[in-house]
């Protein structure tokens, strides 16, 4: 039992436990650096409890401070490829609404073929998060190598 | 006071706050790529509140979505060592029960001597997590360089 | 509503949701390897809810287990710069009170220009966390590239 009896009547959603973990669905067409995500138990170990997907981008449903994390691994890659194709950069940001557009987290691959990071950030209901991979290197769709998620932490 | 009076009577374990942070105990014998972990206040800053260790591997005691995180640093390592001994790969997965065996998180060292990542994943009571380090490089046992942990996030 | 009605009267602070996300303010003078942090809504997306800043260092206000995370990106950097200036190392630790001084998390840049990691660790009220960057490379102050935060997880 996670809480005392009275609380067990509350749906989990009302407790503010919004959380999502996504796997890579596909990359965009030329000139679109966004990664497109998918999630749900039918797909394996990905899920959405609260947030939703809007055309492959993650939309927040509850105001609060979130832990945002991401890992991206490049599929056709070696240390020399990564440095030769430099800069391959991953940026996670709020892409809509336009008035709130901002980069939240940015990493370059340099001589590696994987980046991973996480951060705390305030997000508001309706914020859509985009993950932009700039460069010419293709990301892996293996679910243990490339993933993106958020966890509601507090109001 | 974390919760209102009525809840302060509940043991923390019933609140579902399962959490563990482990330090490296030792590597396995030849042909066993697993890292063996240890935890407890007597060892420093490692601890287990809910999960348990089973022969150096972490066993989950409560169903839920967990944040799994890991950092591994190679002990005798430079950029050139790391690339010469390439590939050194770390994989975190459910290794038992066999019916639920799956790789959850995978990273290669390439030209670096440290990998660090984290992800959200559903885990069930009885799941045992294994961390496999393949390659010929030895991990550091410094507690600030190599560690592995889980945090229960929601049911 | 995060909790049942009775709890909604409680201030968030009493729920133990201490959390902070900081951005780099400045580096120290010569011989001082510490990074100096700042936070607050006026500065962008950084904030302090519970912990406080003491001369640019983060001071904990509530006992508990915390998730500590950090990302640092070097400003004038390429793979060759990073390896030439090796070792550039980042260490996060408790720097006061002196009796509790300990390194919690340590990473080297090797051939990369960004490090990112996270760990669970017990912290006590009054612990001050310092982030030491040793080496001759300058960190970026871009808020999406360099940040440091803590999140209270459980008592």
């Amino acid at each position: 039992q996670r809480f005392a009896q009275a609380q067990q009547q509350l749906p989990l959603e009302s407790l503010g436990w919004d959380v999502a973990e996504l796997q890579l669905n596909h990359t965009g067409p030329q000139q679109d650096p966004r990664l497109y995500w998918q999630g749900g138990p039918a797909l394996g170990r990905s899920f959405l409890h609260g947030p939703e997907l809007d055309k492959g981008q993650l939309r927040i449903h509850r105001d609060g401070i979130y832990m945002v994390h991401i890992q991206v691994t490049l599929a056709i890659c070696s240390s020399t490829t990564a440095s030769r194709h430099h800069p391959t950069t991953l940026a996670v940001g709020i892409c809509s609404p336009a008035s709130r557009s901002i980069s939240l987290l940015r990493l370059s691959f340099h001589q590696g073929c994987t980046i991973a990071s996480q951060r705390l950030t305030p997000l508001a209901r309706g914020d859509t998060l985009c993950t932009n991979l700039t460069g010419t290197l293709l990301p892996s769709r293996n679910t243990d190598e490339t993933f993106f998620g958020v966890q509601w932490v507090r109001p | 006071q974390r919760f209102a009076q009525a809840q302060q009577q509940l043991p923390l374990e019933s609140l579902g706050w399962d959490v563990a942070e482990l330090q490296l105990n030792h590597t396995g014998p030849q042909q066993d790529p697993r890292l063996y972990w240890q935890g407890g206040p007597a060892l420093g800053r490692s601890f287990l509140h809910g999960p348990e260790l089973d022969k150096g591997q972490l066993r989950i005691h409560r169903d839920g979505i967990y944040m799994v995180h890991i950092q591994v640093t190679l002990a005798i390592c430079s950029s050139t060592t790391a690339s010469r001994h390439h590939p050194t790969t770390l994989a975190v997965g459910i290794c038992s029960p066999a019916s639920r065996s799956i790789s959850l998180l995978r990273l290669s060292f390439h030209q670096g001597c440290t990998i660090a990542s984290q992800r959200l994943t559903p885990l069930a009571r009885g799941d045992t997590l294994c961390t496999n380090l393949t390659g010929t490089l030895l991990p550091s046992r410094n507690t600030d360089e190599t560690f592995f942990g889980v945090q229960w996030v929601r049911p | 509503q995060r909790f049942a009605q009775a709890q909604q009267q409680l201030p968030l602070e009493s729920l133990g949701w201490d959390v902070a996300e900081l951005q780099l303010n400045h580096t120290g003078p010569q011989q001082d390897p510490r990074l100096y942090w700042q936070g607050g809504p006026a500065l962008g997306r950084s904030f302090l809810h519970g912990p406080e800043l003491d001369k640019g260092q983060l001071r904990i206000h509530r006992d508990g287990i915390y998730m500590v995370h950090i990302q640092v990106t070097l400003a004038i950097c390429s793979s060759t710069t990073a390896s030439r200036h090796h070792p550039t190392t980042l260490a996060v630790g408790i720097c006061s009170p002196a009796s509790r001084s300990i390194s919690l998390l340590r990473l080297s840049f090797h051939q990369g220009c960004t490090i990112a990691s996270q760990r669970l660790t017990p912290l006590a009220r009054g612990d001050t966390l310092c982030t030491n960057l040793t080496g001759t490379l300058l960190p970026s102050r871009n808020t999406d590239e360099t940040f440091f935060g803590v999140q209270w997880v459980r008592p």
């Epitope: 990359t27 679109d32 056709i76 070696s78 073929c113 769709r141 | 390439h86 590939p87 | -």
Partner: antibody, heavy 119, light 108 residues
């Protein structure tokens, strides 16, 4: 049934150009990265070029970089390879091949190949 | 780039016998990103094994792959008449992906 059918091969003089095409059917073409792999008569297989499922990511072997261009048209389920400044050593059977869903360049389906002779 | 060396060049065996094909990489292959293909005359290659040891869809259980790092092996436990062909190894963990030059399994 997954099918890949190459066309456009033939005899060409050194320095000339050729465009190979690969018509895909039996799967959602726009969901898979694709590659061209070649095999000179009696020789080893050699990876030539790859393209991401959306067309935004392209790769080339050093031996063809600057001379060959890979492209795809997801609306027509076709993969193309434009080969310029052809050399004798480009003589080979050219296969189009589908990447595994992971995007990694191992190939679960191959076409029957089209022969390019540079002479 | 990673160079793959296959041995032996030719393997002469009878149906029912066990075939062991070897492939050695000039550098370690990342995370066992290693594949094996079968090619018959006039045909395209066919994927047998990926991930060093996972059989591709529809591949009979007599085919098995093993190995990690720099040494990989394809084993055919009991040769069937349709197994006589050329076998190629491939690494896809490091760019560019590279192939070995093949081992021909012929009827003795």
């Amino acid at each position: 049934e997954v099918q890949l059918l190459e066309s456009g091969g033939g005899l060409v003089q050194p320095g000339g150009s050729l465009r190979l095409s690969c018509a895909a059917s039996g799967f959602t073409f726009s969901s898979y990265a694709m590659s061209w792999v070649r095999q000179a008569p009696g020789k080893c297989l050699e990876w030539v070029s790859a393209i991401g499922e959306g067309g935004g990511y392209t790769y080339y072997a050093e031996s063809v970089k600057g001379r060959f261009t890979i492209s795809r048209d997801n609306s027509k389920n076709t993969l193309s390879l434009l080969m310029n400044s052809l050399r004798a050593e480009d003589t080979a059977v050219y296969y189009c091949a589908r990447h595994d869903y992971s995007n990694y360049p191992y190939f679960d389906y191959w076409g029957q190949g089209t022969l390019v002779t540079v002479s | 780039e990673i160079v793959l060396t296959q041995s032996p060049g030719t393997l002469s065996l009878s149906p029912g016998e066990r075939a062991t094909l070897s492939c050695r990489a000039s550098q370690g292959v990342r995370s066992s990103y290693f594949a094996w293909y079968q090619q018959k005359p006039g045909q395209a290659p066919r994927l047998l094994i990926y991930g060093a040891s996972t059989r591709a869809t529809g591949i009979p259980a007599r085919f098995s792959g093993s190995g990690s790092g720099t040494d990989f092996t394809l084993t055919i436990s009991r040769l069937e008449p349709e197994d006589f062909a050329v076998y190629y190894c491939q690494q896809y963990g490091s760019s560019p992906p590279t192939f070995g030059c093949g081992t021909k399994v012929e009827i003795k």
